[in-house]
Interface confidence: low
Amino acid sequence: LQDPCSNCPAGTFCDNNRNQICSPCPPNSFSSAGGQRTCDICRQCKGVFRTRKECSSTSNAECDCTPGFHCLGAGCSMCEQDCKQGQELTKKGCKDCCFGTFNDQKRGICRPWTNCSLDGKSVLVNGTKERDVVCGPSPADLSPGASSVTPPAPAREPGHSPQ
């Protein structure tokens, strides 16, 4: 015997309280597939969340984050505060990257500068809080008398920024 609910299209629900007729989803709710016994409440993009796509009877609203914040998690389930390049977010707010680390984005963590010597290369351009070092040719490749920029101090281990 065919399930009568299977005839209910997206945007409706199979209403058990009304003899399994297909009722339209109430305002601020949706069903994205047919045969649903309930409609899901539309996501509301409030506070730091901003509406990217309005809810319809067949699809949920989609949120992004207001300026100064960026999305995290599946479907922008969280908004995290932006920092400037050269900073990372800590529990006490945005903090400058420690010496020997950099962050070239408004999000994420400070990462250690590349250690050019591990690849047998020299430092061509020193690192900053915002930029990684630029590695140049290996010292052996440099012509006699040519000088390279002084290598940076060893990078601190990540995770030692002030909390």
Epitope: K46, G47, V48, A74, S77, M78, E80, Q81, G159
Partner: antibody
């Protein structure tokens, strides 16, 4: 200081429902997600879902979507989790824990003391 | 859902010994990983977040490392109060998922 105080132990019959509570104090209730975590006897931890008190927006682990219903009462800074159609496998300690909306890394920074639910005939 | 495989499931070590617990995710979790300590009858306590950041007040003998899919919790010198079960948690994607736990005992 921040506190999450959960309701007392419950003993329930199979097929019944139970509503557990988690009362928050010491911080702005509406700015943090309240998460619920299950720990069955001798077992590990499972995330059930979370709710954002400001607008009652919820996320559920699909495994618990038909089992748990999360709500909040902003006037009393209390979060609730109702568990329906109880079975013996729902016997567990249930914890509430919080996450700040604006800072993803504050994940589960404070926890309630846990509520023990026993489902037995 | 992202699967978190934690090993070993149990571990016996001597006081003062260095202890290492690992967690492997079924996909890249972008360092969104926390480590928790749970003692019997108590709620879990967060030790480390974002893979390598120590929570305020947690002793410096605890450290975390790793990236991509592979992560490690290290206790540099085991103390009696460290006897507990340890869990990892990924929170890169909903639903957050925990590792199966590592029960740490004194040898």
């Amino acid at each position: 200081q921040v506190q999450l105080v959960q309701s007392g132990a419950e003993v329930k019959k199979p097929g019944s429902s139970v509503k557990l509570s988690c009362k928050a104090s010491g911080y702005t209730f509406s700015s943090y997600w309240i998460n619920w975590v299950k720990q069955a006897p001798g077992q590990g931890l499972e995330w059930i879902g979370n709710i954002y008190p400001s607008d009652s927006y919820t996320n559920y682990n699909q495994k618990f979507k038909d089992k748990a219903t999360l709500t909040v009462d902003k006037s009393t800074s209390t979060a609730y989790m109702e568990l329906s159609s109880l079975r013996s496998e729902d016997t567990a300690v249930y914890y509430c824990t919080r996450t700040w909306e604006f800072y993803y890394d504050s994940v589960f920074d404070y926890w309630g003391q846990g509520t023990t639910l026993t489902v037995s005939s | 859902d992202i699967q978190m495989t934690q090993s070993p499931s149990s571990l016996s070590a001597s006081l003062g010994e260095r202890v290492t617990i690992t967690c492997k995710a079924s996909q890249d979790i972008n360092s969104y990983l926390s480590w928790f300590q749970q003692k019997p009858g108590k709620a879990p306590k967060t030790l480390i977040y974002r893979a390598n950041r120590l929570v305020d007040g947690v002793p410096s003998r605890f450290s975390g490392s790793g990236s991509g899919q592979d992560y490690t919790l290290t206790i540099s010198s085991l103390q009696p109060e460290d006897i507990a079960t340890y869990y990892c948690l990924q929170y890169d994607e909903l639903p957050p998922t925990f590792g199966g736990g590592t029960k740490l005992e004194i040898k």
